[in-house]
């Protein structure tokens, strides 16, 4: 997260760290007791490493009573996701067992009504992604508030030049932005999961390149079918 602040510890109990060989790779969001939603591209970077999900964490390195690392029973990328595009950039991870819920571990309600979030709405993005262009990684969870940008502006030639589909949404990226390592993390508007950080190699913190998020409401049928 660029230009963010340290999040209040355990105030986002849905927040997950998707890890490979014990290292943070991507963000994720607990959407059901045994399921974490993330970005499909995260798996590409996992190669043949052991994928696990950390829940109940604020610090990645310090011991915390609520922290627990779960093995992944099944990884389900969206069937239409492709390595060369950010379309359908969603991944569902089934935990090896149901998560132990509590004040620091709780699923987040996700948006099912397929309607665009009003431009200008402030949404919260959190993650353990890089906090500087130099690539500095934080130990503790960071967050930032970002206003939703209308799709027409986001699709301007100077911005994303028509690449933003109806199944994506954008948020402003002026100094404050999601970045490398935040992919798969939640964009939360009004206490509801609206988007998932896409995992392209987009430049971060440049106002001409707004953040791109996969709209979960657009994938309600797929999410429901996997979770069923």
């Amino acid at each position: 997260i660029l230009g963010g602040r340290e999040a209040e510890a355990h105030a986002r109990p849905y927040m997950a760290s998707v890890q490979v060989n014990g290292e943070h790779l991507c963000g994720g969001v607990l959407v059901a007791e045994q399921w974490v939603l993330s970005a499909a591209h995260c798996l590409e970077d996992a190669a043949d490493g052991k994928v696990q999900v950390l829940l109940g964490a604020h610090s990645l390195s310090q011991p915390e009573p609520s922290k627990r690392l779960y093995d992944v029973l099944r990884a389900v990328p969206h069937p239409d996701s492709r390595p060369d595009t950010i379309d359908h950039d969603l991944l569902l991870l089934q935990l090896s067992e149901k998560a132990t819920l509590g004040p620091a571990v709780r699923p987040l309600p996700w948006q099912r009504v397929d309607r665009d979030v009003e431009p200008g709405t402030l949404c919260d993005v959190a993650g353990w992604g890089i906090v500087s262009h130099a690539g500095r990684r934080p130990d503790r969870l960071q967050h930032v508030l970002l206003p939703v940008l209308d799709r027409a502006t986001c699709n301007r030639r100077t911005h994303h030049d028509g690449a933003i589909t109806q199944r994506m949404m954008c948020a402003e990226s002026n100094r404050r932005d999601s970045c490398k390592g935040d992919s798969g993390g939640p964009l939360v508007c009004g206490g509801v999961l609206e988007g998932v950080v896409t995992s392209g190699s987009r430049v971060c913190g440049n106002r001409k390149k707004p953040g791109i998020y996969t709209r979960v409401a657009s994938y309600a049928a797929w999410i429901d079918s996997v979770l069923a």
């Epitope: 431009p119 200008g120 402030l122 206003p147 940008l149 402003e172 002026n174 009004g190």
Partner: antibody, heavy 120, light 107 residues
Framework: EVKLVESEGGLVQPGSSMKLSCTAS????????MAWVRQVPEKGLEWVGN????????YYLDSLKSRFIISRDSAKNILYLQMSSLKSEDTATYFC?????????????WGQGTSVTVSS | DIQMTQSPASLSASVGETVTITCRAS??????LAWYQQKQGKSPQLIVY???TLAEGVPSRFSGSGSGTQFSLKINSLQPEDFGSYYC?????????FGGGTKLEIK
């Protein structure tokens, strides 16, 4: 020191137009959301609208959307409010304000205000 | 739009007293609430945002609390310069709306 200075308001006829400006200094203008807020004499505050960092997005009070236009010139550090088809109910003191750095719709610095009277 | 309801509309108090002003939102605004002070003929000044964060230069006798739909601003040991009007405002999204104001007068 952060400073916001609005242009002179004045008396205008109903149906006419008026453009207010607000000159900003003491901060990096293009790093902040900006807003206009108005206040009817002896009454409360009413948000008029906001403009984002580079002027690519503007947000307005629904009832003013068709008549008011907010713009900014980041080279000159000036915020504008173009008001058209003015009505007597637009009579108010108009303030420009800077959005707080993190919580964009909280306003941490305000201009001194400029009075606009719409009357025949 | 989210409606903000402030109470009381006016309040008389003496220097040294403690006063509390309340603000209710018509829907959940989480912690996105600001308070402003306005003196007669002057522009408003931000005193608290995000429910309890004091703006730069604001004395610690001011404190904000609440969450969701119910919020309050408390002023301990009132000083002469604290008298004026106070407005709450949600900064949750568009449009950010203000409460009707509370006029704090010297008793």
């Amino acid at each position: 020191e952060v400073k916001l200075v609005e242009s002179e308001g004045g008396l205008v006829q109903p149906g006419s137009s008026m453009k207010l400006s607000c000159t900003a200094s003491g901060f990096t203008f293009s790093d902040y959301y900006m807003a206009w807020v108005r206040q009817v004499p002896e009454k409360g505050l009413e948000w008029v609208g906001n403009i984002n960092y580079d002027g690519s997005s503007t947000y307005y009070l629904d009832s003013l959307k068709s008549r008011f236009i907010i713009s900014r010139d980041s080279a000159k550090n000036i915020l504008y409010l173009q008001m058209s088809s003015l009505k007597s109910e637009d009579t108010a003191t108009y303030f420009c304000a800077r959005g707080e750095d993190f919580y964009l719709y909280a306003m941490d610095y305000w201009g001194q205000g400029t009075s606009v009277t719409v009357s025949s | 739009d989210i409606q903000m309801t402030q109470s009381p509309a006016s309040l008389s108090a003496s220097v040294g007293e403690t006063v509390t002003i309340t603000c209710r939102a018509s829907e959940n605004i989480h912690s996105y609430l600001a308070w402003y002070q306005q003196k007669q003929g002057k522009s408003p000044q931000l005193i608290v945002y995000n429910t309890k964060t004091l703006a730069e230069g604001v004395p610690s006798r001011f404190s904000g609390s609440g969450s969701g739909t119910q919020f309050s601003l408390k002023i301990n040991s009132l000083q002469p310069e604290d008298f004026g009007s106070y407005y709450c405002q949600h900064h949750y999204g568009i449009p950010p709306t203000f409460g009707g104001g509370t006029k704090l007068e010297i008793k």
